[in-house]
Interface confidence: medium
């Protein structure tokens, strides 16, 4: 079938297009191209005659097209009036007709667009912008990109006006960014220069520095004042409600008593109008007060940060003290007083540092105690357990996981499958998983405050078959009569029913054995050297069912008492004397000999040539297995007779 | 028998589109994840994407991001790879693949079923 | 990106020999118990084959002559007694993030 194909399709104003012809046929006599769906005289761009090789333009040629012997008709320098349908008038040598008809479309070059916006210097929380893309242009599509990325979802971000129209409503400060708009159409694509949206805000509750509250008579108060602000803040200071003077500073020399009172900072934003106010209380003493513990760092982190706890206030030829926990303060490498003994430093804080602390004064009647004071110390998070622990999972269930992780503050977890992040939830719940939701399953704990991040990666194994198990053990070299021996069936399965196997029989009845965690564990107490035997689990579900390889047991035991062989302890002079000495026992033990308590060889045998009356005494055979830690031994009377003086002597071995 | 064909033009112009179609046989491509792998000419491999057929998912490797997409047409267990932009750099030979169909195992991402691989040279 | 860097990049080796080739990952692919890297043999004008996975797992039909080793970020790969049709080019690659091949150690046999 003839056929016209558009090269291509959407084509940019200024450029080329290839009608290009398909399937056409054999034997022609000539074609001719036109404009729209249907064959029209008036609307004729250029014929050609085969015979002749003569192409005739029409009254539609524009002097731009290009016809080719193939048929195929190039359109050079496209207008947006070239938009639309093209036909195709084949005649055959048998002056048979055939029409084929093609389109393309024509779009123009976009120009770079910019940015107007409907407020210049928006109000944090109280006004919204509205950015607009110009120019409007038909068949373009609008993007927009915050600092060069593209709109985050947020309920304050509004895209109208076919996306034209970026609002921000309620801006914050936050919001402050480079903005930029972009215009596609199917030929082009245009990026607009950078807008900074300069948001208003504040003044924030300003900041009183130093902290530092209390005063002695005759020092300088020095105090500063600062407020987040866009435009910067205007600052007054008020004491005891009266105005004094519009600074960011204020300083009043060698003070006394009187100037004890509430002192008040007022920063003021003149293009948001707000004011907001900050009140410190100063005391000036003339005299000892009550303690009181500053800290250096009240959220200290836990083995990086120090914490100093300093007694205030600060006076001269004066005892100070302290107490955590009620109690005077332990001898450790990690506490430190200093040289006055008014600050006491935390080397290194753990959790277990969090107090109560408190420090004294003492005068020549009395110690003055401070409020206690406990600290906020910032730990872990620590490495994230997630749970359930099973591994493998059957398909059609639902995968539901929980990460915990220890933290102070309390942890904000991520969930990653593959490596790709899924979600902000300390549960993650995937339901009708399939075998595609098998992989590694990451719980990520973060706390926010510490910085400090960790990770657990678990894998999941979604399949209808179930795997080999294995036997793990808690004890691979158990001791008889005194140890307990637990294997486990690896892994944990859902709806999944376990089995044991000992020497390829089901499990005898026994008090000593007993299966816990749903039969996935089997404990032998106070095992014997007759439970080293060969020990098999296995898995099934409604589908599949798998054997462990056996795990033998290897039971240590012994050394049992020993047997001296021969039996016999008469011997004849001249005889040789071979004692051997044996004991059941897991390792295999050493021997030792002692004759009449003195030691000998530590061989299993003992050998004496040609013994005589000398040789009478008792022979003792003395075991130890290093691995038990228990040791035995046997004696034995020998009594060695002068030849021939008594019948039914041993000639010896 | 689990077959992976890979098929599409052997000659792309530069600055034009590749385009390669997989067409799977002997199981439901619903079922796996759907991967594209290339090898430029005496090069190493490069993996490209992969495509969940179920719902349409993808996710690309970093290097190809902003030029690649992957679409899926379940009715014909196909698959099929398109890359815009083309230079002579991407002259390779692509292929399909997917992981561990005869294993039990749980990474989505090791591949042993292949295609034959389908040679597409970059050219004007 | 997790990098992958193979080697050494060729060898030539005799029939009957032991052959070894090294993947070092830029940080470790191990994770709950699995070490997730895996070793394809290429023979010219052909797709690769998977012959390890999981780091030391045989694939089916493949012969007990491969194996495969390792942990962490660093994995080997050995022929025990090397034969004529094992001349190819064997690729490491890890799938503990988003997958990428090693550079590939093209065997000859002298």
């Known amino acids: 079938k003839l056929t016209i194909e558009s090269t291509p399709f959407n084509v940019a104003e200024g450029k080329e297009v290839l009608l290009l012809v398909h399937n056409l046929p054999q034997h022609l006599f000539g074609y001719s191209w036109y404009k729209g769906e249907r064959v029209d005289g008036n609307r004729q761009i250029i014929g050609y005659v085969i015979g002749t090789q003569q192409a005739t333009p029409g009254p539609a040629y524009s002097g731009r097209e290009i016809i080719y012997p193939n048929a195929s008709l190039l359109i050079q320098n496209i207008i947006q009036n070239d938009t639309g349908f093209y036909t195709l008038h084949v005649i055959k040598s048998d002056l048979v007709n055939e029409e084929a008809t093609g389109q393309f479309r024509v779009y123009p070059e976009l120009p770079k667009p910019s940015i107007s916006s409907n407020n210049s210097k928006p109000v944090e929380d109280k006004d919204a912008v509205a950015f607009t893309c110009e120019p409007e242009t038909q068949d373009a599509t609008y993007l927009w990109w915050v600092n060069n990325q593209s709109l985050p979802v947020s309920p304050r971000l509004q895209l109208s006006n076919g996306n034209r129209t970026l609002t921000l409503f309620n801006v914050t400060r936050n919001d402050t960014a480079s903005y930029k708009c972009e215009t596609q159409n199917p030929v082009s694509a245009r990026r607009s220069d950078s807008v900074i949206l300069n948001v208003l805000y504040g003044p924030d509750a300003p900041t009183i520095s130093p902290l530092n509250t209390s005063y002695r008579s005759g020092e300088n108060l020095n105090l500063s004042c600062h407020a987040a602000s866009n435009p910067p803040a205007q600052y007054s200071w008020f004491v005891n409600g009266t105005f004094q003077q519009s600074t960011q500073e204020l300083f009043i020399p060698n003070i006394t008593v009187n100037n004890s009172g509430s002192y008040t900072c007022q920063a003021h934003n003149s293009d948001t109008g707000l004011n907001r106010t900050t009140v410190t209380t100063i005391t000036v003493y003339a005299e000892p007060p009550k303690p009181f513990i500053t800290s250096n760092n009240s959220n200290p982190v836990e083995d990086e940060d120090a914490v100093a706890l300093t007694c205030e206030p600060e006076i001269q030829n004066t005892t100070y003290l302290w107490w955590v926990n009620n109690q005077s303060l332990p001898v450790s490498p990690r506490l430190q007083l200093s040289n006055d003994n008014r600050t006491l430093t935390l080397l290194s804080v753990t959790r277990n540092d969090v107090g109560p602390y408190e420090c004294g004064i003492q005068n020549e009647l009395s110690v003055d105690h401070s409020d206690p004071v406990i600290l906020n110390v910032l730990y872990g998070p620590d490495d994230p357990t997630i749970s359930p622990s099973y591994t493998y999972y059957r398909p059609g269930v639902n995968l539901s996981l929980s990460c915990h992780a220890a933290s102070n503050p309390p942890a904000q977890y991520s969930w990653l499958i593959d490596g790709n992040i899924q979600q902000h939830t300390q549960e993650l719940f995937i339901s009708n998983i399939t075998e595609k939701n098998s992989g590694l399953y990451t719980c990520q704990a973060n706390n926010s405050a510490s910085g400090h991040s960790r990770t657990t990666v678990k894998t999941i194994t979604v399949s209808a078959e179930l795997p080999k198990p294995s036997i793990s053990s808690n004890n691979s070299k158990p001791v008889e009569d005194k140890d307990a021996v637990a294997f486990t069936c690896e892994p944990e399965a859902q709806n999944t029913t376990y089995l044991w196997w000992v020497n390829g029989q089901s499990l005898p009845v026994s008090p000593r054995l007993q299966l816990s965690n749903g039969n996935r564990t089997l404990t032998l107490f106070n095992v014997t050297r007759n439970d080293a035997r060969a020990y098999v689990c296995g898995i099934q579900n409604s589908v599949s069912a798998n054997r462990s390889d056996p795990v033998t047991l290897d039971v240590l035991y012994g050394p049992d008492t020993p047997i001296i062989s021969p039996p016999d302890s008469s011997y004849l002079s001249g005889a040789n004397l071979n004692l051997s000495c044996h004991s059941a026992s897991n390792p295999s033990p050493q021997y030792s000999w002692r004759i009449n308590g003195i030691p000998q060889q530590h061989t299993q045998v003992l050998f004496i040539a040609k013994i005589t009356p000398n040789n009478n005494g008792t022979y003792a055979c003395f075991v130890s297995n290093l691995a038990t830690g228990r040791n035995n031994s046997i004696v034995k009377s020998i009594t060695v007779s002068a030849s021939g003086t008594s019948p039914g002597l041993s000639a010896g071995a | 028998q689990v077959q992976l064909q890979e098929s599409g033009p052997g000659l792309v112009r530069p600055s034009q589109t590749l385009s390669l179609t997989c067409t799977v046989s002997g199981f439901n491509i619903k079922d796996y994840y759907m991967h594209w792998v290339r090898q430029p000419p005496g090069r190493g491999l490069e993996w490209i994407g992969w495509?969940?057929?179920?719902?349409?998912?993808?996710e690309y490797a970093p290097k190809f991001q902003g030029r690649v997409t992957m679409l899926v047409d379940t009715s014909k267990n196909q698959f099929s790879l398109r890359l815009s932009s083309v230079t002579a750099a991407d002259t390779a030979v692509y292929y399909c693949?997917?992981?561990?169909?005869?294993?039990?195992?749980?990474?989505?991402?090791?591949?042993?079923?292949w295609g034959q691989g389908s040679l597409v040279t970059v050219s004007s | 990106d997790i990098q992958m860097t193979q080697s050494p990049s060729s060898l030539s080796a005799s029939v009957g020999d032991r052959v070894t080739i090294t993947c070092r990952a830029s940080k470790s692919v191990s994770a709950s118990g699995y070490s997730y890297m895996h070793w394809y043999q290429q023979t010219p004008g052909k797709a690769p084959k998977l012959l390890i996975y999981?780091?030391?797992n045989l694939q089916s039909g493949v012969p007990s002559r491969f194996s495969g080793s390792g942990s962490g970020t660093d994995y080997t790969f050995t022929i025990s007694s090397l034969q004529p049709e094992d001349i190819a080019t064997y690729y490491c690659?890890?799938?503990?993030?988003?997958?990428?091949f090693g550079q590939g150690t093209k065997l000859q046999i002298t």
């Open positions: 693949n997917t992981r561990g169909l005869s294993t039990m195992i749980t990474t989505r991402w090791f591949f042993d079923v």
């Open positions: 495509i969940d057929p179920e719902n349409g998912d993808t």
């Open positions: 999981l780091a030391s």
């Open positions: 690659q890890h799938s503990r993030e988003l997958p990428t």
